[in-house]
């Protein structure tokens, strides 16, 4: 059994969340990957996903979320720029592998965004040229809409839960709808 753990990030409005999800590259290099939010009492919602097959080092931007999949390193980089208080919540990286259900990658991210920017002089966290360097790109296809054979009757646990894991990815028992956010101009 595997403990489903969370890592907390406390950030201010306007700042950037920057996390890396580690996956087994031999298994999942070209698999489609997604960034999801888990809200209490709901199934996870997919906010953004890579292309299918996932392209190496090719940034995909959906609204304020940027995904970059580095096949050679077995890493999915996720950035959420210009954070807002309402972005606070529990997030996870998943790997799509139809017809099987998605795998979740360690750790879940508990994001806490508070009011007020606490940068320092010389900080470029809020600068337009810093945030918008990556060409706005959207996925060519919508993220998959799987339906799980099992129904979800309660929200995913907030603390820790025991789940079985093949290798280092957790087998999810539910999947998700997709939120499309306007792409930056």
């Amino acid at each position: 059994a595997t403990k489903l753990t969370e890592e907390k990030y406390e950030l201010k409005e306007g700042q950037t969340l920057d996390v890396k999800c580690d996956y087994t590259l031999e298994k999942f290099a070209s698999s489609q990957k997604a960034w999801q939010i888990i809200r209490d009492g709901e199934m996870p919602k997919t906010l953004a996903c890579t292309e299918r097959p996932s392209k190496n080092s090719h940034p995909v931007q959906v609204g304020r979320i940027i995904l970059e999949d580095y096949h050679d390193h077995g890493l999915l980089r996720v950035r959420m720029v210009n954070l807002q208080v309402e972005d606070s919540g529990l997030y996870q990286c998943v790997i799509y592998q139809p017809p099987k259900e998605p795998h979740m990658l360690f750790d879940r991210i508990r994001l806490v965004v508070t009011k007020g920017f606490s940068g320092t002089p010389g900080s470029n966290e809020n600068s337009t040229q810093n945030v918008y360097k990556i060409p706005p790109t959207t996925t060519k296809a919508l993220c998959p809409l799987y339906t799980s054979p099992r129904t979800v009757t309660q929200a995913p646990p907030k603390s820790t839960a025991d789940v079985s894991t093949p290798d280092s990815e957790i087998n999810l028992t539910n999947v998700t709808d997709i939120i499309r956010v306007p792409v930056f101009n």
């Epitope: 890592e7 580690d22 087994t24 980089r77 966290e125 810093n130 290798d167």
Partner: antibody, heavy 119, light 108 residues
Framework: EVQVLESGGGLVQPGGSLRLSCAAS????????MSWVRQAPGKGLEWVST????????YYADSVKGRFTISRDNSKNTLDLQMNSLRAADTAVYYC????????????WGQGTLVTVSS | EIVMTQSPATLSVSPGERATLSCRAS??????LAWYQQKPGQAPRLLIY???TRATGIPDRFSGSGSGTEFTLTISSLQSEDFAVYYC??????????FGQGTKVEIK
């Protein structure tokens, strides 16, 4: 409680070899990357090597590339560092460190094992 | 390779006073910065990650700020157990992941 414990340090002659081991407990070992970080006497910290949770990806500092090999046995929750062609400059306390699940920083450290390379 | 520069090398502070430690990156690392504390004969201990977030069990007198290239670790009221060496580390993306040379906080 997360615990990591290093072993295998000692005195070795220049050009010699040594194998460090690290035993981990208290967390899902195969879900996290692991690293070695060293500290020469009276000096600062230097990252040495990292291996991904599955063992499929390895990284090395230029100073040890081609001489050191990092490996892990997820069935035994152990991490190893095989050090060959050792030099005096490799003398340091070697720390085994668990890498965080979301980024490449080190959230738990062992107490370290001293490697002395001297003739 | 990103170079991390800490200042000052040594900081002399009286117990109860505020300590401000600086760390500068040679290029932007956004908020991909961690701070560690190391006492003599002990392993480093994670204090702050993501530039701002305190690690589990770290008292709230420790706070991190900054982004891009300039970062600060502030200890609001130094306790006797806080006298130690402090290191910053970047983790923007791929290796090598580099540490600053350290700032020693000593009793004034």
């Amino acid at each position: 409680e997360v615990q990591v414990l290093e072993s295998g340090g000692g005195l070795v002659q220049p050009g010699g070899s040594l194998r460090l081991s690290c035993a981990a407990s208290g967390f899902t070992f195969n879900a996290y990357a692991m690293s070695w970080v060293r500290q020469a006497p009276g000096k600062g910290l230097e990252w040495v090597s990292t291996i991904s949770g599955s063992g499929s990806t390895t990284y090395y500092a230029d100073s040890v590339k081609g001489r050191f090999t990092i490996s892990r046995d997820n069935s035994k929750n152990t991490l190893d560092l095989q050090m060959n062609s050792l030099r005096a400059a490799d003398t340091a306390v070697y720390y085994c460190a668990k890498v965080a699940g979301s980024n490449f920083f080190f959230d738990h450290w062992g107490q370290g094992t001293l490697v002395t390379v001297s003739s | 390779e990103i170079v991390m520069t800490q200042s000052p090398a040594t900081l002399s502070v009286s117990p109860g006073e505020r300590a401000t430690l600086s760390c500068r990156a040679s290029q932007s690392i956004n908020s991909n910065l961690a701070w560690y504390q190391q006492k003599p004969g002990q392993a480093p201990r994670l204090l702050i990650y993501g530039a701002y977030t305190r690690a589990t069990g770290i008292p709230d007198r420790f706070s991190g700020s900054g982004s891009g290239t300039e970062f600060t670790l502030t200890i609001s009221s130094l306790q006797s157990e806080d006298f130690a060496v402090y290191y910053c580390q970047e983790f923007i993306m791929f290796p090598p992941w580099t540490f600053g040379q350290g700032t020693k906080v000593e009793i004034k």
